[in-house]
Amino acid sequence: IWELKKDVYVVELDWYPDAPGEMVVLTCDTPEEDGITWTLDQSSEVLGSGKTLTIQVKEFGDAGQYTCHKGGEVLSHSLLLLHKKEDGIWSTDILKDQKEPKNKTFLRCEAKNYSGRFTCWWLTTISTDLTFSVKSSRGSSDPQGVTCGAATLSAERVRGDNKEYEYSVECQEDSACPAAEESLPIEVMVDAVHKLKYENYTSSFFIRDIIKPDPPKNLQLKPLKNSRQVEVSWEYPDTWSTPHSYFSLTFCVQVQGKSKREKKDRVFTDKTSATVICRKNASISVRAQDRYYSSSWSEWASVPCS
Amino acid sequence: RNLPVATPDPGMFPCLHHSQNLLRAVSNMLQKARQTLEFYPCTSEEIDHEDITKDKTSTVEACLPLELTKNESCLNSRETSFITNGSCLASRKTSFMMALCLSSIYEDLKMYQVEFKTMNAKLLMDPKRQIFLDQNMLAVIDELMQALNFNSETVPQKSSLEEPDFYKTKIKLCILLHAFRIRAVTIDRVMSYLNAS
């Protein structure tokens, strides 16, 4: 058993049928010695008396808010949550496995640049009685500071018969140098509590590996005289690290017909312009990627050929 | 402590092409190592990230773009002095700091070159003959060092009398390649910045 926060405790259980569970001793936070009784949740049934209460915690029915009283007055509370270890693995019932980029990916994180700011998100089908708390650091043995905000519900989607809820959090490394070579990964820890179930999820990454630039901005077409060709031009996104000559991007320019089946023409360039043939009803799209470290491509920025 | 926006003579900054080749070569070698050594801890998540140049060179700090010198987190307290002559300095106006930066890059390359050559000698003794260093990568390191053209004492290749532990050598190779790729990215960024300056 360990303390999650004041008066909230997590009991770790090896989860299998007929498991013996864990013996837990609760102590009433009071100078009083006599006339103390204990109850669980809203029930008025007295579970025991005395300054301490010993319970065998085996299943969720044994978890909840234990309260000690004296003469009708509440003295203190202890909330017991359960953390299940099933098949040698801590349970992951609360969050959905996003399976990208690999199995058992519950937390996904992205950064728009090298400033040390990043966003993480996760999915669940649970809509109520759900709380999250996020902590982060650079490295784990001698951790350096990363400050995270509160997790917020950022999107709701319908997937078949189920509703899916996306939560996200923004974090900022306290003293980040965009040019630094990372040797210690960022660690993100999410505590999730659903009713009386506790779970924790972690992700470990280097900022360089989660970079995904914003799409190029100010995408414009300039027809070339007496030609079906156009000059496409764009700019670096505002959110990208500066100076751009140091933090350079490379670009992919795509000409896509109306039909998805039509052949796509693609050009790769380090410049912020390119000359392409603009077909009728086609659209021109441009996306960006760090020129020197191949992390994710940005989403496409698009303009119609007409 | 930084790179001023110097104005080199017109034309391609001599080392940019070599640094791009270097990044390509080390990235290819790392990919090959990850595929060949798939049953070894060779991915970024599995290895310990070590920097053999730590406390010996200060490339990131010495080559910091002018725009980042206002960022206190970028101003590390490490001081290292380097030899200051070299043919990549395309302009007489190039400052002392730029020379310091380029000589730091040269020292990095020299250190990695020695490590890789020592390691290759061990890998050639492996009866499994599982993996060797790409000669192209070693040649590209050499080319960039020649382009930088700094006079520096030659570091003798380390020789070891004891029987090599091939498992450890292959893990060390992965660690070295990951670190060298990160340094090659920094070198490429620096050369691109200097070229634009």
């Epitope: 090896d14 989860w15 299998y16 049928p17 007929d18 498991a19 299943e59 969720f60 270890k85 099933e86 098949d87 040698g88 693995i89 992951t92 019932d93 496995d97 690999k102 199995n103 058992k104 089908t125 | 801890p41 599995e46």
Partner: antibody, heavy 115, light 111 residues
Framework: QVQLVQSGGGVVQPGRSLRLSCAAS????????MHWVRQAPGKGLEWVAF????????YYADSVKGRFTISRDNSKNTLYLQMKSLRAEDTAVYYC????????WGQGTMVTVSS | SYVLTQPPSVSGTPGQRVTISCSGG????????VKWYQQLPGTAPKLLIY???QRPSGVPDRFSGSKSGTSASLAITGVQAEDEADYYC????????????FGTGTKVTVL
């Protein structure tokens, strides 16, 4: 005490279907994940499928993916394995087992796929 | 599809110490716990060891389990005639939720 009683095995022709059942008693069935494991004659144990306590997630071995479906009815305390497009190599004794570091096994049921 | 490797057979005379090895990798034994089962002919596997070294009640103390790195082993100190059976190790795969991975199995013969 914990008991898992299996049924539904038998002889079936290749390409046909069969449904195995596993009736659980002596524990809160709806609180625990369940597995199916099989053993071909004279061979070792092979994991087949797993279902979460609430049926929300199901996982399968590559050898049965797309052909077998694990399911459960918590109101009936029963686990199922629907097997379609059966092949000769699916011939085995099938066991249901509880999840957890300390697990309980059914008595096994023989499935023979033969023409 | 056996991910864990065991010797096909081991033998010993009554009273001898017999050990069975189980070799895996970083994604299974290296990052998860190990169980051992005993299977007598025509019966369901019986749990002998769980959580690497825990013995269920009713399992004689001559059976013991241990784990080190990516390998595990089962020891039978003072093997008896009734211990003649097939033995399987089992772990979980870190990269694949829910999946149990079994050893190839070892036939223990008491001479």
């Amino acid at each position: 005490q914990v008991q898992l009683v299996q049924s539904g095995g038998g002889v079936v022709q290749p390409g046909r279907s069969l449904r195995l059942s596993c009736a659980a008693s002596g524990f809160t069935f709806s609180s625990y994940g369940m597995h199916w494991v099989r053993q071909a004659p004279g061979k070792g144990l092979e994991w087949v499928a797993f279902i979460r306590y609430d049926g929300s997630n199901k996982y399968y071995a590559d050898s049965v993916k797309g052909r077998f479906t694990i399911s459960r009815d918590n109101s009936k305390n029963t686990l199922y394995l629907q097997m379609k497009s059966l092949r000769a190599e699916d011939t085995a004794v099938y066991y249901c087992t509880t999840s957890g570091s300390y697990d309980y096994w059914g008595q096994g049921t023989m499935v023979t796929v033969s023409s | 599809s056996y991910v864990l490797t065991q010797p096909p057979s081991v033998s010993g005379t009554p009273g001898q110490r017999v050990t069975i090895s189980c070799s895996g990798g970083r994604s299974n034994i290296g990052s998860n716990t190990v169980k051992w089962y005993q299977q007598l002919p025509g019966t369901a596997p019986k749990l002998l060891i769980y959580g690497n070294d825990q013995r269920p009640s009713g399992v004689p103390d001559r059976f013991s389990g241990s784990k080190s790195g990516t390998s595990a082993s089962l020891a039978i100190t003072g093997v008896q005639a009734e211990d003649e059976a097939d033995y399987y190790c089992q772990s979980y795969d870190r990269g694949f939720t829910g999946s149990r991975v079994f050893g190839t199995g070892t036939k223990v013969t008491v001479l």
